[in-house]
């Protein structure tokens, strides 16, 4: 079966939009005007895995780069990075664990969390022009909370 | 009984501002994305706003971004569509229709609002 | 954007005459194609999502078909509360656009 993909952009919930920061790092900061089109939009993909009414799986590819965000353990610890792929094999319907996330929609919000590690999520911080990161706590001073504005292709 | 009822429309001059709602009732609001399609008058269809169960996601074509906003109140089982700057061209019913979760087809279909933008 | 092509824009048909709508896309959307109907005055309906698969309650002489680029409804034998407006939509990639719809009138 074919993936479907469609454009979108994400901010965490106090309205930091995403940019790129070097080749393989997100980082999160306030935009505003003509800087809008700074952040980046990613290509998300509904793919295969456990799926409810309020859980979604999906890869989170940049648009038109050969970049994924995934999870993998560093130093025994889940971390988020931006992973390199073979552009003729993805996106895909089954895509591998460490690149899927459970999109859940609570009341007006998102998470992401790793299918991979359970109870993690795409995280933010607090601080302005800060890297994105694959956080372990929910509620506390870093922000797994943020909002997705679909985009016409 | 599956039942959207869509409120709000009417005469608006250039510039003006409308703010639609749609109230939901016969199903559970809040499992369900939402749409606004309209249909110019003898004209074909247009999707223009969609929004999650939830509200945590929105979508707006290139026609009407920046001016429409949409929103809901779960607890009211109500859809709105805040239009602003509005233009000669946005003159249309406007549909309320419920959407299957994953941003696909519209199952179920107010009856609509007209709203006329005129001088 | 996927442009949509319905045709004919519009046809004549008398009760019980099989009718055939076209629908064909800029770009290959698999099967992610719905039909609906719309009569006069009146809220569109949906007919047929995923191409084939007939909505709840839309009687059977209705089909949908193809995949790709190009797509057909059939109405095997017109009925009176057949003559219609009916809409193609994709829902492939934003923005999800209609066809330009095609008008089943009274022979």
């Known amino acids: 079966a074919p993936v479907r993909s469609l454009n979108c952009t994400l901010r965490d919930s106090q309205q930091k939009s995403l940019v790129m920061s070097g080749p393989y790092e997100l980082k999160a900061l306030h935009l505003q005007g003509q800087d809008m089109e700074q952040q980046v939009v990613f290509s998300m993909s509904f793919v295969q895995g456990e799926e409810s009414n309020d859980k979604i799986p999906v890869a989170l590819g940049l648009k038109e780069k050969n970049l994924y965000l995934s999870c993998v353990l560093k130093d025994d610890k889940p971390t988020l990075q931006l992973e390199s792929v073979d552009p003729k094999n993805y996106p895909k319907k089954k895509m591998e664990k460490r690149f899927v996330f459970n999109k859940i929609e609570i009341n007006n919000k998102l998470e992401f969390e790793s299918a991979q590690f359970p109870n993690w999520y795409i995280s933010t911080s607090q601080a302005e022009n800060m890297p994105v990161f694959l956080g372990g706590t929910k509620g506390g001073q870093d922000i797994t909370d943020f909002t997705m504005q679909f985009v016409s292709s | 009984e599956v039942q959207l009822v869509e409120s709000g429309g009417g005469l608006v001059q250039p510039g003006g501002s409308l703010r639609l709602s749609c109230a939901a009732s016969?199903?559970?609001?809040?499992?369900?994305?939402m749409s606004w399609v309209r249909q110019a008058p003898g004209k074909g269809l247009e999707w223009v706003a969609y929004i999650s169960s939830g509200g945590g996601s929105t979508y707006f074509p290139d026609t009407v971004k920046g001016r429409f906003t949409i929103s809901r109140d779960n607890a009211k089982n109500t859809l709105y569509l805040q239009m602003n700057s509005l233009r000669a061209e946005d003159t249309a019913m406007y549909y309320c229709?419920?959407?299957?979760?994953?941003?696909?087809?519209?199952?179920?279909w107010g009856q609509g609002t007209l709203v006329t933008v005129s001088s | 954007d996927i442009q949509m092509t319905q045709s004919p824009s519009s046809l004549s048909a008398s009760v019980g005459d099989r009718v055939t709508i076209t629908c064909r896309t800029s770009?290959?959307?698999?099967?992610?194609l719905t039909w609906y109907q719309q009569k006069p005055g009146k809220a569109p309906q949906l007919l047929v999502y995923n191409a084939k698969t007939l909505a709840d309650g839309v009687p059977s002489r209705f089909s949908g078909s193809g995949s790709g680029t190009q797509f057909t409804l059939t109405i095997s034998s017109l009925q009176p509360e057949d003559f219609a407006n009916y809409y193609c939509q994709h829902f492939w990639s934003l923005p999800f656009t209609f066809g330009q719809g095609t008008k089943v009138e009274i022979k």
């Open positions: 770009g290959n959307i698999h099967n992610y």
């Open positions: 016969g199903f559970d609001f809040s499992r369900y994305d």
């Open positions: 229709a419920r959407q299957n979760k994953k941003l696909t087809w519209f199952d179920y």
